[in-house]
């Protein structure tokens, strides 16, 4: 899925791997490899619940979709799925609930036409940032990728690594600017706590964002104003406590614009008056009637859209010596 | 260092068979595909196809089917391309190389093989 | 099958020249492009591989470019040793196919 210029530095390093591993596929066209189903007429190779420690290297040249879900991979090195010739047709790559917990540099080059990858359900404790640019270069060739499936990829607590988890996934997502062509990426269920400011405005090509079953607070810092394309942004069941008069603004700047936020503990004081205005006289928000209040006690399960501005007040702050304890 | 170094000319007479031989050194031999290429006098290359030494499996041109038949010997590192049914289109000069996927590319070749069919 | 086509049969140049040559696939090969270097003697060298990748032991005065169906074959500065023939060849599909081959001679 790489041009040369995204190659060359990986795949240096990567040629061990690929001499004893890959070059050694046996070159018969149309075979199946043991343990998977292929469909010629489908252009389909399903490998899927037999605990395959490898991706098979005898894969059929003709293979468009291909699922690998329900294994054992453990690692993805670098060309994993690297043949020659290349698997030229290969669109969608679905590799969910695989047991991954680590994807190397290059893991998806050569892979000319992949539109569609799913690492969903593994714990990738280590994303490559060129996981899905194949190259340390600042600016890499297009990935072809259109849709990239990340939902639930977070390791447990135990397994992560000394980093930020948000931090590792969004390197991997702007390394090289590869992935400019992405219209749908899926990060749900992922415990995110922020989303990294410069994430996107890197993605100028996005269509569909779903965020939804994250641990998001706030979007102050985030900026939607040069997702032009955007047609569905998913926030349900996250911790978003108001949305700010800059994210109101920008949102309804979005000309295609759909967004979801049902389940937050949204908080019904002063500060939520002009997120109310907006949601009245918005169209953009989708089952806008069903938000509803979580704080403060005395506001729970009141609906957003009925409130008016005298419900919405702060309590005042005593200064220290009045304040009981 | 990588080398292939291929049989020698052959002169044989139509309707008969002839194997040209394509020995590898300086690299694993079974970690390689190898493959086979045709040159007519004056003209441009033809992929005939493939094998991999490791596993035997083989691939090949629709062109050369039933025409070229390919095998591998891992014991003494060497490749073979038996050409049958010969006529004067297989006069041509035959190159095995070595094919590999860091590369994508046939990187090294052999110096080539003459066979000329004729009676 | 994909066509290979080099629509420059042969071509004249001086020593020290900056020579172009070119290939045109029949259908996208997405950087699956290889060129080689047939001398007199019938001799086969990789020169360039997956469009730009320098091939150890080639000059650097050898570079190569491209993308989606066009691709060209640099020689910066034209020396004796690069009389020869060239030949393109796509690595994307079987059967692998070659451009009819430049052969390349000094003015």
């Known amino acids: 899925s790489s041009s040369p210029t995204s190659s060359a530095s990986s795949f240096s390093s990567s040629a061990p791997f690929l001499a004893s591993a890959v070059s050694a596929q046996p070159p018969l066209p149309d075979q199946c490899p043991a343990l998977c189903e292929c469909s010629e007429a489908a252009r389909t190779v399903k490998c899927v619940n037999r605990n395959l420690t490898e991706v098979p290297t005898d894969l059929p040249a003709y293979v468009r979709n291909l699922f690998l879900t329900g294994n054992q991979l453990a690692v993805l090195p670098a060309g994993a799925f690297a043949r020659r010739p290349p698997l030229a047709e290969l669109a969608a790559l679905n590799l969910s609930g695989s047991r991954l917990d680590e994807v190397r540099a290059g893991a998806f080059e050569h892979l000319p036409s992949l539109r569609q990858l799913d690492l969903s359900h593994n714990p990738l404790a280590d994303l490559s940032p060129f996981a899905f640019s194949g190259s340390n270069a600042s600016v890499s060739a297009p990935s072809p990728l259109v849709e990239l499936i990340l939902n639930h990829i977070v390791p447990p607590e135990d397994e992560r690594q000394n980093r930020s988890f948000e931090g590792m996934v969004v390197a991997a997502l702007l390394a090289g600017r590869a992935l400019q062509g992405l219209r749908r990426l899926e990060l749900a269920s992922n415990h995110f706590l922020y989303l990294p400011r410069d994430v996107l405005a890197q993605l100028p090509s996005l269509r569909h964002l779903d965020l939804s079953n994250n641990s998001l607070v706030s979007l102050t810092y985030v900026s939607f104003r040069n997702l032009t394309h955007l047609e569905s942004l998913h926030l349900e069941d996250n911790a978003l406590k108001v949305l700010h008069n800059g994210t109101l603004a920008e949102l309804q700047g979005l000309p295609h614009i759909r967004v979801f936020l049902d389940n937050n503990p949204w908080v019904c004081d002063c500060h939520m008056a002009d997120m109310v205005t907006w949601l009245k006289e918005t169209e953009v928000v989708q089952g806008k009637d069903r938000l509803t209040c979580a704080y403060p006690e005395k506001m729970r399960n009141r609906v957003l859209l009925e409130l008016n501005s005298a419900d919405l007040d702060c309590d005042p702050i005593l200064p220290p010596s009045l304040q009981t304890s | 260092q990588v080398h292939l170094q291929q049989s020698g000319a052959e002169l044989v007479r139509p309707g008969t068979s002839v194997k040209v031989s394509c020995k590898a050194s300086?690299?694993?031999?079974?970690?390689?595909?190898i493959e086979w290429v045709k040159q007519r006098p004056g003209q441009g290359l033809e992929w005939i196809g493939v094998?991999?030494?490791?596993?035997?499996?083989?691939n090949y041109n629709e062109n050369f089917k039933g025409k070229a038949t390919l095998t591998a010997d891992k014991s003494s590192s060497t490749a073979y391309m038996q050409l049958s049914s010969l006529t004067s289109e297989d006069s041509a000069v035959y190159f095995c190389?070595?094919?590999?996927?860091?590369?994508?590319?046939?990187?090294?070749w052999g110096q080539g093989t003459s066979v000329t069919v004729s009676s | 099958d994909i066509q290979m086509t080099q629509t420059t049969s042969s071509l004249s140049a001086s020593l020290g020249d900056r020579v172009t040559i070119s290939c045109r696939a029949s259908?996208?090969?997405?950087?699956?492009l290889n060129w080689y270097q047939q001398k007199p003697d019938g001799t086969v060298k990789l020169l360039i591989s997956?469009?730009?990748r320098l091939h150890s032991g080639v000059p650097s005065r050898f570079s190569g470019s491209g993308s989606g169906t066009d691709y060209s074959l640099t020689i910066s500065n034209l020396e004796q040793e690069d009389i020869a023939t060239y030949f393109c060849?796509?690595?994307?599909?079987?059967?692998?196919?070659f451009g009819g081959g430049t052969e390349l001679e000094i003015k």
């Open positions: 190389a070595r094919g590999t996927v860091e590369l994508y590319a046939m990187d090294y």
């Open positions: 300086g690299y694993a031999f079974t970690n390689y595909v």
């Open positions: 094998i991999n030494p490791g596993s035997g499996g083989t």
């Open positions: 259908q996208d090969i997405s950087y699956y």
């Open positions: 997956y469009t730009s």
């Open positions: 060849q796509q690595d994307i599909k079987h059967p692998y196919t």
